[in-house]
Interface confidence: low
């Protein structure tokens, strides 16, 4: 990674070091595997919704009343914890991008083939919005041996 020169970059680096992005990686891997399992069906039809509680006992209807608050938007354990971690980057779009890039890097070796890599990348780009957070406008998620185009 490049040298971090600015105060904000140092803060981002320490945020990234503190962050546990593993739940995000697990959530995304589960999601693309679930999507592959349900390939060929309408993923959002009520009887076949891959997110439905009957198919994923960890997942509650994200906007149904919860014991804590009717706004409880719990999805899977991993997504809840992932959103918690990404929330730390909400006010720093560059740092949010760094977090997404780190997730991509960490999982790149586990992705089998170009199609799965593209699917993972697509889900990763959607991740901030699924947590209700702003997504970085420009964020290069290509994993290369050379340096990446920075924010």
């Amino acid at each position: 990674r490049q040298q971090w020169e600015l105060q904000g970059d140092r803060r981002c680096q320490s945020q990234l070091e503190r962050a546990n992005l593993r739940p995000c990686e697990q959530h995304l891997m589960q999601k693309i595997q679930r999507d592959e399992d349900s390939y060929g069906r309408d993923p959002y039809s009520p009887s076949q919704d891959p997110y439905s509680p009957s198919q994923d006992p960890d997942r509650r209807d994200p906007y149904s009343p919860s014991p804590y608050d009717r706004r409880g938007a719990g999805s899977s354990q991993h997504q809840e914890r992932c959103c918690n971690e990404l929330n730390e980057f909400e006010n720093n779009q560059r740092c949010m991008c760094e977090a997404l890039q780190q997730i991509m890097e960490n999982q790149s070796d586990r992705l089998q083939g170009r199609q799965q890599e593209q699917q993972f990348k697509r889900e990763l780009r959607n991740l901030p919005q699924q947590c209700g957070l702003r997504a970085p406008q420009r964020c290069d998620l290509e994993v290369e041996s050379g340096g990446r185009d920075r924010y």
Epitope: Y51, P62, C83
Partner: antibody, heavy 129, light 106 residues
Framework: QVQLVQSGAEVRKPGSSVKVSCKAS????????ITWVRQAPGQGLEWMGW????????NYAQKFQGRVTITADESTSTAYMELSSLKSEDTALFYC??????????????????????WGQGTLVTVSS | ETVLTQSPATLSLSPGERATLSCRAS??????LAWYQHKPGQAPRLLIY???NRATGIPARFSGSGSGTDFTLTISSLEPEDSAVYYC????????FGGGTKVEIK
């Protein structure tokens, strides 16, 4: 920039139903809740319910429970609000709006707080015999 | 359900004057309160979210403050185009709007 375009004005008889559409263009549709709000003549704004297209989940205000159905078609980026058993008091302007739904999480449970940042132009529904 | 009470019902001020609109919640909503401007024949417009954050494109003369149960929308120097009804709205409990404050420019 996301825009929401609603269907045109409707006139209905008491006891019938009305279905209003709200088409999104110029941005993501699936991830943000689409909310429906109504304003009766001379009255304030009233939340009716919402849908999150990506999850196909809905929630409705108690006042409208059983009479309102909100649906979404991801393929056309369109949300729909159907209100049944219409009464003359249902004469109102109906708005759809995108909910920016900012999430915050605590003890493993995520919550959202709502602010409607993009609105449709409104659809006037008149219920009259 | 959380009830939002806005005051005053009507505010009649001259251009350049400062407008202070109040919104009181029947129970704490933290900082999760939004303000909207609504003009006749137009869709409502988001001004402020999370109590004090100005929405995109909103002039700096609009500011929000408060937390818990008491919130304020301030228009520092009224312009003729600020004539509208202003609503507060909370999203921590079932979504509710306040009854609105009508701002008239003399």
């Amino acid at each position: 920039q996301v825009q929401l375009v609603q269907s045109g004005a409707e006139v209905r008889k008491p006891g019938s139903s009305v279905k209003v559409s709200c088409k999104a263009s110029g941005g993501t549709f699936s991830n943000n809740p689409i909310t429906w709000v109504r304003q009766a003549p001379g009255q304030g704004l009233e939340w009716m319910g919402w849908i999150i297209p990506i999850f196909n989940t809905t929630n409705y205000a108690q006042k409208f429970q059983g009479r309102v159905t909100i649906t979404a078609d991801e393929s056309t980026s369109t949300a729909y609000m159907e209100l049944s058993s219409l009464k003359s008091e249902d004469t109102a302007l109906f708005y759809c709006a995108r909910d920016r739904a900012h999430a915050y999480c605590n003890n493993g449970v995520c919550y959202t707080t709502d602010a409607f940042d993009v609105w449709g132009q409104g659809t006037l529904v008149t219920v009259s015999s | 359900e959380t009830v939002l009470t806005q005051s005053p019902a009507t505010l009649s001020l001259s251009p350049g004057e400062r407008a202070t609109l109040s919104c009181r919640a029947s129970q704490s909503v933290g900082r999760y309160l939004a303000w909207y401007q609504h003009k006749p024949g137009q869709a409502p417009r988001l001004l402020i979210y999370d109590a004090s954050n100005r929405a995109t494109g909103i002039p700096a003369r609009f500011s929000g403050s408060g937390s818990g149960t008491d919130f304020t929308l301030t228009i520092s120097s009224l312009e003729p185009e600020d004539s509208a009804v202003y609503y507060c709205q909370q999203g921590t409990d079932w979504l509710t709007f306040g009854g609105g404050t009508k701002v008239e420019i003399k």
